[in-house]
């Protein structure tokens, strides 16, 4: 190996992970590098053998979905990319150690907000992940993070908010005025892993009082 500066071929190889969907991304130092092809390998911590990722060999795009290959959420992984230019120059770069449990970000929850006359019901739908349990079913975020809870806030007016929270999926803000618009925000929190999702936002109006 003759050392040379190949930083213009390949930079910033990293995992981008959201709800355990793990995408490997990278960049070239050049504005455009149409003659450069990329090949991806991955491995688990302490394994000697790098495995070639099928479908990500000699590609021109700068991302590769490694969700299936990195599907054990208790494992640590590495990935590396080799860039080869038409002129024969090559560069290999690897990621830092990747743990999806530690590094995945949480997307906003999927929530149904149901207005009633004097209350608003909020039903949080479980977020499934691509991770399979031993029996083959897909795990939810709740399955993976034992300490996961939901934080709900209802903006009543500029100065007053109501708060609810817990592990259950069904909530109701009560004692509201009929025929009034409210802004609800619902976030997922995983304190042990210092994770918090961006909020799901629903703007709902309580029903008019017909009595």
């Amino acid at each position: 190996h003759i050392a040379e500066d190949t930083s213009d071929l390949l930079q910033y190889v990293k995992f981008q992970s959201s709800n355990f969907e793990n995408i490997l991304t990278w960049d070239s130092g050049l504005e455009s590098a149409p003659d450069v092809v990329y090949s991806v390998e991955y491995k688990t911590y302490g394994k000697k053998e790098w495995l070639a990722k099928e479908g990500c060999q000699r590609i021109t795009r700068k991302s590769c979905n490694l969700t299936t290959e990195t599907g054990n959420h208790t494992e640590h992984y590495y990935a590396r990319v080799t860039a080869v230019s038409a002129g024969g120059r090559s560069a290999t770069k690897m990621t830092d150690r990747f743990s999806s449990m530690q590094q995945t970000t949480i997307k906003p929850p999927d929530v149904t907000c149901i207005p009633k006359v004097r209350s608003i019901q909020m039903i949080v739908h479980p977020t499934s992940t691509p991770i399979h349990a031993e029996d083959g079913h897909l795990l939810t975020l709740e399955d993976i993070f034992q300490d996961l809870f939901y934080r709900l806030e209802l903006q009543v007016n500029h100065t007053y908010q109501m708060h609810l929270g817990g592990k259950q999926r069904d909530y109701e803000f009560i004692g509201l005025s009929p025929d009034t618009e409210f802004l609800g925000t619902i976030t997922i929190s995983v304190p042990n892993f210092f994770k918090e999702s961006a909020p799901y936002v629903c703007r709902v109006k309580t029903l008019p009082d017909r009595t």
């Epitope: 911590y45 208790t74 494992e75 640590h76 590495y78 290999t92 690897m94 150690r97």
Partner: antibody, heavy 116, light 113 residues
Framework: EVQLVESGGGLVQPGGSLRLSCAAS????????MNWVRQAPGKGLEWIGE????????TYNQKFKGRFTISVDQSKNTAYLQMNSLRAEDTAVYYC?????????WGQGTLVTVSS | DIVMTQSPDSLAVSLGERATINCKSS????????????LAWYQQKPGQPPKLLIY???SRESGVPDRFSGSGSGTDFTLTISSLQAEDVAVYYC?????????FGQGTKVEIK
Amino acid sequence: EVQLVESGGGLVQPGGSLRLSCAASGYSITAEYMNWVRQAPGKGLEWIGEINPSTGTTTYNQKFKGRFTISVDQSKNTAYLQMNSLRAEDTAVYYCARFDAYFDYWGQGTLVTVSS
Amino acid sequence: DIVMTQSPDSLAVSLGERATINCKSSQSLLYSSNQKNTLAWYQQKPGQPPKLLIYWASSRESGVPDRFSGSGSGTDFTLTISSLQAEDVAVYYCQQYYSYPFTFGQGTKVEIK
């Protein structure tokens, strides 16, 4: 064939500094983690720290954090160990060793003697 | 830090006889993800760097003679040389890679009786 060659060792006075080099050949240094391990005369092995040469991310044995710094020059395919505020007890053979968990390739080592 | 303790400190064995080195860790080295143990063994001859013999407690490094074997789980591990050869005279070290900082045992010196 993978080879690691350390250099830069020698005699240094207490309080002095030294930079050790580890030149890798037979592979791209950015393809695997690199570690530094030391061995005092007649003693056992002590892990100093590691670097991901691709990203520059380092992890240190707390014992050496602050005094020792690991870095890489990708264009030279070389890793470095910068040692500051050296003491007599830092006298040892310093090895670079490849891999992220156990160490599959080692250099021959370079001797650092801290003495006045 | 995980403390690695080897026994004995030195060992004299006749040529062709079995040599057994023990290594005990201060906490379990069982890696839950793959149910393997994060333990390696090295051989170091005078004036040379250590040489990897065994990783994952029992996987032999390529090119290492099959008279070397590793066993054990959790906190107790063993390196066995089934039939000691003259070229096996060396110091042997265990190393954990379960958590930072990686730590080594103090070494066991193997000599010929």
